[in-house]
Protein backbone atom coordinates (compact mmCIF):
# COMPACT_ATOMS: atom_id res chain seq x y z
CA UNK A 1 0.00 0.00 0.00
CA UNK A 2 1.41 3.40 -1.04
CA UNK A 3 1.04 6.14 1.53
CA UNK A 4 1.01 9.77 0.54
CA UNK A 5 3.48 11.95 2.42
CA UNK A 6 2.59 15.63 1.92
CA UNK A 7 5.93 16.70 3.41
CA UNK A 8 9.51 15.44 3.12
CA UNK A 9 11.09 13.44 5.95
CA UNK A 10 11.79 15.59 9.03
CA UNK A 11 9.45 18.36 7.82
CA UNK A 12 6.26 19.27 9.74
CA UNK A 13 2.85 19.63 8.08
CA UNK A 14 0.50 22.47 9.06
CA UNK A 15 -2.51 23.84 7.14
CA UNK A 16 -1.33 22.87 3.67
CA UNK A 17 2.31 23.78 4.11
CA UNK A 18 5.50 22.00 5.14
CA UNK A 19 7.96 23.47 7.63
CA UNK A 20 11.58 22.59 8.31
CA UNK A 21 13.02 23.61 11.66
CA UNK A 22 16.80 23.62 11.32
CA UNK A 23 19.12 21.90 13.75
CA UNK A 24 22.11 24.06 12.86
CA UNK A 25 22.61 27.81 12.86
CA UNK A 26 23.31 30.33 10.10
CA UNK A 27 23.11 34.07 9.62
CA UNK A 28 19.93 35.50 8.10
CA UNK A 29 21.15 35.67 4.49
CA UNK A 30 22.59 32.16 4.62
CA UNK A 31 19.30 30.94 6.08
CA UNK A 32 17.55 32.28 2.97
CA UNK A 33 20.00 30.34 0.81
CA UNK A 34 19.55 27.18 2.87
CA UNK A 35 15.81 27.29 2.30
CA UNK A 36 16.20 27.99 -1.42
CA UNK A 37 18.49 24.98 -1.72
CA UNK A 38 15.64 22.70 -0.64
CA UNK A 39 13.02 24.40 -2.83
CA UNK A 40 11.57 26.42 0.02
CA UNK A 41 11.56 29.94 1.44
CA UNK A 42 12.64 31.36 4.77
CA UNK A 43 9.26 31.40 6.48
CA UNK A 44 6.75 34.11 5.53
CA UNK A 45 3.83 34.22 7.96
CA UNK A 46 0.39 34.63 6.43
CA UNK A 47 -2.06 34.14 9.28
CA UNK A 48 -2.52 34.31 13.05
CA UNK A 49 -2.90 30.53 13.14
CA UNK A 50 0.40 30.04 11.35
CA UNK A 51 2.11 32.53 13.67
CA UNK A 52 0.80 30.74 16.74
CA UNK A 53 1.95 27.37 15.40
CA UNK A 54 5.46 28.61 14.57
CA UNK A 55 5.87 30.59 17.78
CA UNK A 56 4.96 27.47 19.72
CA UNK A 57 7.51 25.38 17.82
CA UNK A 58 10.20 27.94 18.48
CA UNK A 59 9.42 28.58 22.15
CA UNK A 60 9.09 24.84 22.88
CA UNK A 61 12.60 24.24 21.62
CA UNK A 62 13.81 27.40 23.38
CA UNK A 63 15.62 28.56 20.24
CA UNK A 64 16.15 31.95 18.65
CA UNK A 65 14.97 31.34 15.10
CA UNK A 66 15.11 33.46 11.94
CA UNK A 67 11.95 34.22 9.95
CA UNK A 68 11.84 35.78 6.48
CA UNK A 69 11.26 39.35 7.65
CA UNK A 70 13.64 42.33 7.60
CA UNK A 71 13.87 46.10 7.25
CA UNK A 72 17.16 45.93 5.35
CA UNK A 73 15.77 47.85 2.36
CA UNK A 74 14.44 50.76 4.37
CA UNK A 75 14.90 51.27 8.09
CA UNK A 76 11.60 50.81 9.91
CA UNK A 77 9.77 49.40 6.90
CA UNK A 78 9.44 45.68 7.54
CA UNK A 79 9.07 43.48 4.50
CA UNK A 80 8.86 39.72 4.01
CA UNK A 81 11.28 37.92 1.70
CA UNK A 82 8.47 37.39 -0.84
CA UNK A 83 8.19 41.18 -1.19
CA UNK A 84 5.00 41.67 0.81
CA UNK A 85 4.97 44.50 3.34
CA UNK A 86 4.31 43.54 6.95
CA UNK A 87 0.61 44.09 7.60
CA UNK A 88 -0.08 46.35 10.60
CA UNK A 89 -2.23 43.59 12.12
CA UNK A 90 0.94 41.51 12.55
CA UNK A 91 2.76 44.17 14.57
CA UNK A 92 1.13 42.81 17.72
CA UNK A 93 3.58 39.89 17.60
CA UNK A 94 6.65 41.99 18.40
CA UNK A 95 7.88 41.53 21.95
CA UNK A 96 7.41 44.55 24.20
CA UNK A 97 9.73 47.37 23.14
CA UNK A 98 10.56 45.70 19.82
CA UNK A 99 11.62 46.30 17.14
CA UNK A 100 14.19 48.62 18.71
CA UNK A 101 17.00 48.60 16.11
CA UNK A 102 19.68 48.59 18.82
CA UNK A 103 22.96 48.46 16.90
CA UNK A 104 21.53 47.97 13.42
CA UNK A 105 19.07 45.15 14.10
CA UNK A 106 17.41 44.61 10.74
CA UNK A 107 16.27 40.97 10.73
CA UNK A 108 13.42 39.36 12.64
CA UNK A 109 13.55 36.27 14.82
CA UNK A 110 11.22 34.23 16.97
CA UNK A 111 12.30 35.01 20.53
CA UNK A 112 10.41 33.69 23.54
CA UNK A 113 6.71 34.36 23.05
CA UNK A 114 7.07 36.88 20.24
CA UNK A 115 9.32 38.55 17.68
CA UNK A 116 12.58 40.43 18.11
CA UNK A 117 14.82 42.31 15.72
CA UNK A 118 18.48 41.31 15.78
CA UNK A 119 21.68 41.71 13.80
CA UNK A 120 21.41 39.83 10.51
CA UNK A 121 24.97 38.51 10.69
CA UNK A 122 24.31 36.48 13.84
CA UNK A 123 23.99 32.71 13.52
CA UNK A 124 20.58 31.38 14.55
CA UNK A 125 18.28 28.49 13.76
CA UNK A 126 15.85 29.02 10.90
CA UNK A 127 12.51 27.79 9.55
CA UNK A 128 11.85 26.99 5.88
CA UNK A 129 8.37 26.79 4.38
CA UNK A 130 7.00 25.27 1.17
CA UNK A 131 3.64 24.09 -0.10
CA UNK A 132 2.68 20.55 0.83
CA UNK A 133 2.40 17.93 -1.90
CA UNK A 134 -1.12 17.13 -3.07
CA UNK A 135 -2.32 13.74 -1.93
CA UNK A 136 -5.36 13.53 -4.21
CA UNK A 137 -5.31 10.85 -6.79
Amino acid sequence: ERLCHPCPWEWTFFQGNCYFMSNSQRNWHDSITACQEVGAQLVVIKSAEEQNFLQLQSSRSNRFTWMGLSDLNHEGTWQWVDGSPLLPSFKQYWNKGEPNNVGEEDCAEFSGNGWNDDKCNLAKFWICKKSAASCSG
Epitope: W80, D82, S84, P85
Partner: antibody, heavy 119, light 107 residues
Framework: QVQLQESGPGLVKPSETLSLTCTVS????????VHWIRQPPGKGLEWIGV???????DYNAAFMSRVTISKDDSKSQVSLKLSSVTAADTAVYYC?????????????WGQGTTVTVSS | DIQLTQSPSFLSASVGDRVTITCKAS??????VAWYQQKPGKAPKLLIY???TRHTGVPSRFSGSGSGTEYTLTISSLQPEDFATYYC?????????FGQGTKLEIK
Amino acid sequence: QVQLQESGPGLVKPSETLSLTCTVSGFSLTNYGVHWIRQPPGKGLEWIGVIWRGESTDYNAAFMSRVTISKDDSKSQVSLKLSSVTAADTAVYYCARNGGSSGWYFDVWGQGTTVTVSS
Amino acid sequence: DIQLTQSPSFLSASVGDRVTITCKASQDVTSAVAWYQQKPGKAPKLLIYWTSTRHTGVPSRFSGSGSGTEYTLTISSLQPEDFATYYCQQHYTTPLTFGQGTKLEIK
Protein backbone atom coordinates in the same frame (compact mmCIF):
# COMPACT_ATOMS: atom_id res chain seq x y z
CA GLN B 1 5.77 55.53 -17.52
CA VAL B 2 4.14 52.92 -15.29
CA GLN B 3 1.21 51.23 -16.99
CA LEU B 4 -0.96 48.16 -16.50
CA GLN B 5 -3.35 46.80 -19.10
CA GLU B 6 -5.96 44.08 -18.60
CA SER B 7 -7.06 41.82 -21.44
CA GLY B 8 -9.26 38.78 -21.89
CA PRO B 9 -12.65 37.66 -23.15
CA GLY B 10 -15.53 40.01 -22.43
CA LEU B 11 -18.06 37.19 -22.26
CA VAL B 12 -17.81 34.00 -20.20
CA LYS B 13 -20.43 31.28 -19.82
CA PRO B 14 -21.71 30.27 -16.39
CA SER B 15 -19.70 27.44 -14.73
CA GLU B 16 -16.71 28.16 -16.98
CA THR B 17 -13.36 29.72 -15.99
CA LEU B 18 -12.69 33.42 -16.38
CA SER B 19 -9.11 34.06 -17.55
CA LEU B 20 -7.60 37.54 -17.64
CA THR B 21 -4.10 38.85 -18.27
CA CYS B 22 -2.49 42.01 -16.92
CA THR B 23 0.47 43.25 -18.96
CA VAL B 24 2.67 45.76 -17.17
CA SER B 25 5.25 48.24 -18.40
CA GLY B 26 7.49 50.84 -16.77
CA PHE B 27 8.32 48.57 -13.85
CA SER B 28 9.36 44.99 -13.18
CA LEU B 29 7.27 42.26 -11.61
CA THR B 30 10.44 41.21 -9.77
CA ASN B 31 10.17 44.44 -7.75
CA TYR B 32 6.44 44.95 -7.17
CA GLY B 33 3.32 43.03 -6.24
CA VAL B 34 0.23 43.17 -8.46
CA HIS B 35 -3.34 42.97 -7.17
CA TRP B 36 -6.65 42.11 -8.82
CA ILE B 37 -9.72 44.10 -7.80
CA ARG B 38 -13.21 43.98 -9.30
CA GLN B 39 -16.23 46.25 -9.43
CA PRO B 40 -19.68 44.85 -10.24
CA PRO B 41 -21.91 47.19 -12.30
CA GLY B 42 -22.96 50.22 -10.25
CA LYS B 43 -21.30 48.84 -7.10
CA GLY B 44 -18.18 49.25 -5.01
CA LEU B 45 -14.71 47.73 -5.15
CA GLU B 46 -13.81 44.20 -4.06
CA TRP B 47 -10.25 42.91 -3.55
CA ILE B 48 -9.62 39.49 -5.10
CA GLY B 49 -5.95 38.86 -4.35
CA VAL B 50 -2.30 39.69 -5.00
CA ILE B 51 0.87 38.09 -6.29
CA TRP B 52 4.12 39.32 -4.79
CA ARG B 53 7.54 39.71 -6.38
CA GLY B 54 8.61 36.38 -4.87
CA GLU B 55 5.61 34.65 -6.50
CA SER B 56 3.72 34.02 -3.27
CA THR B 57 0.03 34.89 -3.34
CA ASP B 58 -2.60 36.16 -0.92
CA TYR B 59 -6.29 35.72 -1.71
CA ASN B 60 -9.55 37.04 -0.38
CA ALA B 61 -11.12 34.05 1.43
CA ALA B 62 -14.36 34.80 -0.43
CA PHE B 63 -12.63 33.62 -3.64
CA MET B 64 -10.07 31.21 -2.18
CA SER B 65 -11.55 27.97 -3.52
CA ARG B 66 -11.77 29.15 -7.12
CA VAL B 67 -9.08 31.78 -7.74
CA THR B 68 -5.52 31.44 -9.02
CA ILE B 69 -3.13 34.33 -9.65
CA SER B 70 0.15 33.61 -11.39
CA LYS B 71 2.78 35.56 -13.32
CA ASP B 72 5.48 35.39 -15.95
CA ASP B 73 8.22 37.87 -15.06
CA SER B 74 9.89 37.60 -18.47
CA LYS B 75 6.66 38.55 -20.25
CA SER B 76 5.72 41.15 -17.63
CA GLN B 77 2.34 39.49 -17.30
CA VAL B 78 0.11 38.57 -14.39
CA SER B 79 -2.86 36.27 -14.90
CA LEU B 80 -6.11 35.82 -13.03
CA LYS B 81 -8.17 32.65 -13.25
CA LEU B 82 -11.58 32.45 -11.59
CA SER B 83 -13.38 29.13 -11.95
CA SER B 84 -17.06 28.15 -11.77
CA VAL B 85 -18.27 31.64 -12.57
CA THR B 86 -21.87 32.80 -12.13
CA ALA B 87 -23.73 35.98 -13.05
CA ALA B 88 -22.52 37.45 -9.74
CA ASP B 89 -18.99 37.51 -11.19
CA THR B 90 -20.04 40.02 -13.86
CA ALA B 91 -17.85 43.05 -13.19
CA VAL B 92 -15.09 45.34 -14.35
CA TYR B 93 -11.82 43.65 -13.40
CA TYR B 94 -8.79 45.80 -12.59
CA CYS B 95 -5.17 44.94 -11.97
CA ALA B 96 -3.21 47.40 -9.86
CA ARG B 97 0.35 47.76 -8.65
CA ASN B 98 1.09 47.52 -4.95
CA GLY B 99 2.23 50.90 -3.69
CA GLY B 100 5.73 49.98 -2.62
CA SER B 101 7.17 48.46 0.53
CA SER B 102 5.20 50.35 3.17
CA GLY B 103 1.69 48.99 2.76
CA TRP B 104 -0.97 47.10 0.86
CA TYR B 105 -2.56 49.84 -1.25
CA PHE B 106 -2.72 50.46 -4.99
CA ASP B 107 -0.72 53.28 -6.55
CA VAL B 108 -1.32 52.62 -10.28
CA TRP B 109 -4.34 50.90 -11.84
CA GLY B 110 -5.09 49.43 -15.23
CA GLN B 111 -8.03 50.86 -17.15
CA GLY B 112 -10.14 47.79 -16.36
CA THR B 113 -11.77 45.16 -18.53
CA THR B 114 -15.48 44.35 -18.46
CA VAL B 115 -16.43 40.70 -18.05
CA THR B 116 -20.01 39.55 -18.47
CA VAL B 117 -21.08 36.10 -17.33
CA SER B 118 -23.99 34.95 -19.43
CA SER B 119 -25.05 31.96 -21.50
CA ASP C 1 -13.61 41.01 7.65
CA ILE C 2 -13.26 44.70 8.49
CA GLN C 3 -16.26 46.74 7.37
CA LEU C 4 -15.75 50.34 6.24
CA THR C 5 -18.77 52.66 6.27
CA GLN C 6 -18.52 55.95 4.43
CA SER C 7 -20.69 58.94 5.11
CA PRO C 8 -22.39 60.54 3.44
CA SER C 9 -23.10 58.22 0.51
CA PHE C 10 -24.06 61.23 -1.61
CA LEU C 11 -22.87 64.78 -1.27
CA SER C 12 -23.88 67.86 -3.25
CA ALA C 13 -21.49 70.79 -3.17
CA SER C 14 -20.36 73.79 -5.17
CA VAL C 15 -17.01 74.80 -6.63
CA GLY C 16 -14.95 76.43 -3.88
CA ASP C 17 -16.68 74.56 -1.05
CA ARG C 18 -14.81 72.69 1.65
CA VAL C 19 -16.05 69.11 1.92
CA THR C 20 -15.32 66.28 4.32
CA ILE C 21 -15.97 62.58 3.79
CA THR C 22 -15.86 60.19 6.72
CA CYS C 23 -14.84 56.53 6.78
CA LYS C 24 -15.68 54.46 9.87
CA ALA C 25 -14.02 51.07 10.39
CA SER C 26 -15.58 48.19 12.33
CA GLN C 27 -12.33 47.91 14.32
CA ASP C 28 -9.12 49.87 14.91
CA VAL C 29 -7.07 49.92 11.69
CA THR C 30 -4.11 51.85 13.16
CA SER C 31 -3.98 54.54 10.43
CA ALA C 32 -3.73 51.98 7.61
CA VAL C 33 -6.25 53.80 5.41
CA ALA C 34 -6.04 54.89 1.78
CA TRP C 35 -8.37 57.08 -0.29
CA TYR C 36 -9.16 56.81 -4.01
CA GLN C 37 -10.99 58.97 -6.53
CA GLN C 38 -12.98 57.38 -9.35
CA LYS C 39 -14.65 59.09 -12.29
CA PRO C 40 -17.35 57.38 -14.39
CA GLY C 41 -15.93 54.74 -16.75
CA LYS C 42 -12.42 55.18 -15.35
CA ALA C 43 -10.19 53.31 -12.93
CA PRO C 44 -9.76 54.61 -9.37
CA LYS C 45 -6.77 56.85 -8.63
CA LEU C 46 -4.80 56.81 -5.40
CA LEU C 47 -5.04 60.08 -3.47
CA ILE C 48 -3.82 59.31 0.05
CA TYR C 49 -2.32 56.36 1.94
CA TRP C 50 -1.40 55.77 5.57
CA THR C 51 -4.22 58.17 6.53
CA SER C 52 -2.50 61.40 5.54
CA THR C 53 0.33 60.83 3.04
CA ARG C 54 -0.55 62.37 -0.33
CA HIS C 55 0.36 60.30 -3.37
CA THR C 56 2.73 61.84 -5.93
CA GLY C 57 1.06 64.57 -7.96
CA VAL C 58 -2.06 64.85 -5.80
CA PRO C 59 -3.00 68.52 -5.22
CA SER C 60 -2.54 69.91 -1.70
CA ARG C 61 -6.27 70.67 -1.41
CA PHE C 62 -6.72 66.97 -0.64
CA SER C 63 -5.85 65.99 2.91
CA GLY C 64 -6.51 63.07 5.18
CA SER C 65 -6.68 62.63 8.91
CA GLY C 66 -7.93 60.28 11.59
CA SER C 67 -6.97 57.46 13.91
CA GLY C 68 -8.45 54.37 15.48
CA THR C 69 -11.72 53.64 13.71
CA GLU C 70 -12.55 57.06 12.21
CA TYR C 71 -10.88 58.67 9.20
CA THR C 72 -11.65 61.67 7.03
CA LEU C 73 -10.81 62.95 3.57
CA THR C 74 -11.06 66.72 3.21
CA ILE C 75 -11.07 68.75 0.01
CA SER C 76 -10.35 72.32 1.07
CA SER C 77 -11.67 74.10 -2.01
CA LEU C 78 -13.59 72.04 -4.55
CA GLN C 79 -12.50 72.30 -8.17
CA PRO C 80 -14.66 71.23 -11.15
CA GLU C 81 -12.48 68.16 -11.72
CA ASP C 82 -13.08 66.92 -8.15
CA PHE C 83 -16.65 65.81 -8.77
CA ALA C 84 -16.34 62.03 -8.63
CA THR C 85 -16.84 59.03 -6.33
CA TYR C 86 -14.43 58.59 -3.44
CA TYR C 87 -13.55 55.31 -1.73
CA CYS C 88 -11.64 54.56 1.45
CA GLN C 89 -9.67 51.31 1.81
CA GLN C 90 -8.11 49.66 4.86
CA HIS C 91 -4.67 48.08 4.50
CA TYR C 92 -4.50 46.93 8.12
CA THR C 93 -5.24 43.29 7.40
CA THR C 94 -6.53 40.88 4.77
CA PRO C 95 -8.90 40.74 3.13
CA LEU C 96 -8.32 44.31 2.04
CA THR C 97 -11.69 46.05 2.08
CA PHE C 98 -13.22 49.26 0.72
CA GLY C 99 -15.95 51.61 1.81
CA GLN C 100 -19.12 51.65 -0.26
CA GLY C 101 -18.17 55.00 -1.82
CA THR C 102 -19.23 58.63 -1.57
CA LYS C 103 -20.56 60.26 -4.72
CA LEU C 104 -19.70 63.94 -4.84
CA GLU C 105 -22.03 65.85 -7.17
CA ILE C 106 -22.30 69.43 -8.32
CA LYS C 107 -24.99 71.39 -6.50
